[in-house]
Interface confidence: low
């Protein structure tokens, strides 16, 4: 009993003075609590509590259930307590069959003991089975036994107190373990798409599947650099024991252009935290960009192939789409694809091939596209460059001789003579008149050179060579001459084509 | 000063075992996760091991499950790496890391300077 | 595990601004961080999260998170940026980390 110094309050005085009683069942409990300040009694076990005013508590019958603490407190908040045990040997045990632990923590599975002299006093898994060999625990007689450091593999895990009785093994009735996860990990957050794009009035709806080991992970929906809180709505499952799954999903009816902007998905729990964003992009009308993926004015040489490509984006997606040239449209020779199969892909690709292009097909490509909302188009001019072709080569009335060549780019002539029998031409010849001439072809087409010199100059036998040339190569046209006495005399011109 | 010093490495023959040592200074050693991350010559970096603070938490890289065992001694602000049955591909230079979470970031933020292992017969 | 994709190797011209650019699937739910490495050195943080700079890093550099896409950004390079460069992220699974196989970038 507690020793009193004056002028102090000192915590009541209990009979029988001891810390622990037992009693047997149908025996009667007597507890006489002496303080002049005495306020009340107070019984306790498991979650049960009971409360008597009068200084003297008396059970005639005692029972198992009146196992427990019993407390006598004064008015100045000090108290002293006894423990009675009511030995009942049909019933060891009294019990609270709820059983919860949370992860890396310690759990009590609360049998307390009507008999403080039973041995053995344990936990035996349910119909035989061994318990988890990792599994430690700490009985006391008073409050239960206490598993230390509960482990996930413990869940749903089937449980009996256990005692020693004259010999025999007596068991609680059973209890289930239901283990609490720790967060050992950030949550796992995705999201359905990582942009949108809608026009004004469309619908905007996103969901964020948030993964964790239980419920409590808490999570939301935000708006990058706001606090208004978004409507959500939540369906959630549970994969099993440690896999949960939510669903948060956001939708905004009619979305108008400010509603623009990035959403984050956030979640957290007691490890950390995780997030995902998602751009929403609302415009007032569908649009169509045209980027050439190459200059839009090509130079390309005769016979070979030239690809005309482009990459467009649309929204709504495109519907028509046409090559066009010289009011002709293409209907094979090109293709248009997506240029990634996501399906928020607005960016796509058109190419039309051109193959073994002659000197004729220069001329405006166009690429036209439409969706429902606008019309786009883009031109390519194509020039095909072609080595050039002597097209005449003429001694003129007036002694002139005159060449005239075609070709893209324009080709320059230059005139040499070979004087007497020399197969090599070097001396040059400066022309008296060039002029380029208007072409009837189209407007892309080979550009015409007209040269012209006088023949009066030479006074030897020999040849003339013109000699047309540009970027892709080069040709020559030879005219032969020879004087007859005091007459010259023309010899029919030949073109000798080098290479 | 803040350091992390790997030590252990060297020249075993496939199917042999190293214990690689890794000591920390300069911090609160045991609140911080920590990693093992190696570079194979001439190659890039790959994540091998990663254990939390409390050594409750430990993942590998598929490469090394079953083979490597990482572990800590926050009394000796030390990390190991215990590498079994070790094959001709995991010879790299192992970098210990510090490895941590802000806000949700992961990155590592405290390399040492590493320590070669050599597998070849 | 999901891997991260980079560029071998990258050459920007002295002061001029060049991109280095991760992809992966992991990359769509996790942030990427960045690290450079230089011969015979051990890596250095220079980028995490939302474009989060480490104290001690230039102010030229800068990151950048699209999609299933990560970029780190060198504005007005030096001759000292001269590096290997790794970005690196949780692995979808979200209990490995995952390396991209680096980008050599040179400094002309």
């Known amino acids: 009993q507690p020793s009193v110094s004056p002028g102090e309050p000192s915590p009541p005085s209990i009979h029988p003075g001891k810390s622990d009683l037992i009693v047997r069942v149908g025996d009667e409990i007597r507890l006489l609590c002496t303080d002049p300040g005495f306020v009340k009694w107070t019984f306790e076990i498991l979650d049960e509590t009971n409360e008597n005013k009068q200084n003297e508590w008396i059970t005639e019958k005692a029972e198992a259930t009146n196992t427990g603490k019993y407390t006598c407190t004064n008015k100045h908040g000090l108290s002293n307590s006894i423990y009675v045990f009511v030995r009942d040997p049909a019933k060891l045990f009294l019990v609270d069959r709820s059983l919860y632990g949370k992860e890396d923590n310690d759990t009590l599975v609360r049998c307390p003991l009507t008999d403080p002299e039973v041995t053995n006093y344990s936990l035996k898994g349910c119909q035989g089975k061994p318990l988890p060999k990792d599994l430690r625990f700490i009985p006391d007689p008073k409050a239960g036994i206490m598993i230390k450091s509960v482990k996930r593999a413990y869940h749903r895990l089937c449980l009996h107190c256990s005692v020693d009785q004259e010999g025999k093994s007596v068991l609680s009735e059973k209890f289930i373990l239901k283990v609490r996860p720790a967060f050992k990990a950030v949550p796992v957050v995705s999201v359905s798409k990582a942009s949108y794009l809608l026009r004004e009035g469309e619908e905007f709806t996103v969901t964020c599947t948030i993964k964790d080991v239980s419920s409590s992970v808490y999570s939301t929906w935000k708006r990058e650099n706001s606090q208004t809180k978004l409507q959500e709505k939540y369906n959630s499952w549970h994969h099993g024991d440690f896999n949960y799954e939510r669903q948060a999903t956001l939708t905004i009816s009619s979305a108008r252009v400010n509603d623009s902007g990035v959403f984050m998905c956030y979640a957290n729990n007691t490890f950390g935290s995780a997030n995902v964003t998602t751009t929403l992009e609302v415009v007032d009308k569908g649009f169509i960009n045209i980027f050439p993926m190459i200059n839009t004015t090509v130079f390309v040489n005769d016979g070979e192939n030239v690809d005309l490509i482009v990459e467009y984006e649309a929204f709504p997606k495109p519907e028509h789409q046409q090559w066009i040239y010289m009011n002709r449209t293409f209907t094979d020779k090109w293709e248009d694809y997506p240029k990634s199969e996501n399906e928020s892909n607005i960016r796509y690709v058109s190419e039309l091939h051109l193959t073994r292009l002659k000197g004729t097909e220069g001329g405006t490509y166009t690429f036209l596209v439409s969706n429902s909302d606008v019309n786009a188009a883009i031109a390519f001019n194509v020039y095909v460059n072609t080595k050039p072709e002597i097209l005449t080569y003429d001694r003129l009335v007036n002694g002139m001789l005159q060449c005239v060549a075609a070709g893209f780019p324009e080709p320059t002539i230059d005139w040499y003579f070979c004087p007497g029998t020399e197969q090599r031409c070097s001396a040059s010849v400066l022309p008296v008149d060039v002029q380029t001439l208007n072409s009837s072809g189209p407007p892309f087409g080979k550009l015409v050179v007209q040269s012209s010199i006088d023949s009066s100059a030479f006074k030897h036998n020999g040849t003339v060579e013109c000699k047309a040339y540009n970027d892709v190569g080069k040709t020559s046209a030879y005219f032969n001459f020879a004087f007859k006495g005091n007459n010259k005399e023309q010899i029919h011109p030949h073109t000798l084509f080098t290479p | 000063q803040v350091k992390l010093q790997e030590s252990g490495g060297g020249l075993v023959q496939p199917g042999g075992s190293l214990r690689l040592s890794c000591a920390a200074s300069?911090?609160?050693?045991?609140?911080?996760?920590m990693s093992w991350v190696r570079q194979a010559p001439g190659k890039g970096l790959e994540w091998v091991s990663y254990?939390?603070?409390?050594?409750?938490?430990?993942y590998y890289v598929d490469s090394v499950k079953g083979r490597f065992t990482i572990s800590r001694d926050n009394a000796k602000n030390s990390l190991y790496l215990q590498m079994n049955s070790l094959r001709d591909e995991d010879t790299a230079v192992y970098y210990c890391?510090?490895?941590?979470?802000?806000?949700?970031?992961?990155?590592?933020?405290?390399w040492g300077r590493g320590t070669l292992v050599t597998v070849s017969s | 595990q999901s891997a991260l994709t980079q560029d071998p190797a990258v050459s920007v011209a002295l002061g001029q601004t060049v991109r280095i650019t991760c992809q992966g699937d992991s990359l769509r739910s996790y942030f990427a961080s960045w690290y450079q490495q230089k011969p015979g050195q051990a890596p250095l943080l220079v980028m995490y999260?939302?474009?989060i700079r480490p104290s001690g890093i230039p102010d030229r550099f800068s990151g950048s998170s699209s999609g299933n896409s990560a970029s780190l950004t060198i504005t007005g390079a030096q001759a000292e940026d001269e590096a290997d460069y790794y970005c690196?992220?949780?692995?979808?699974?979200?209990?490995?980390?995952?390396f991209g196989g680096g980008t050599k970038l040179t400094v002309l």
């Open positions: 999260g939302q474009n």
């Open positions: 890391a510090r490895l941590r979470n802000s806000e949700g970031y992961w990155y590592f933020d405290l």
């Open positions: 300069g911090f609160t050693f045991d609140s911080y996760a």
């Open positions: 254990i939390t603070s409390s050594s409750s938490t430990i």
């Open positions: 690196n992220s949780r692995d979808s699974s979200y209990n490995h980390w995952v």
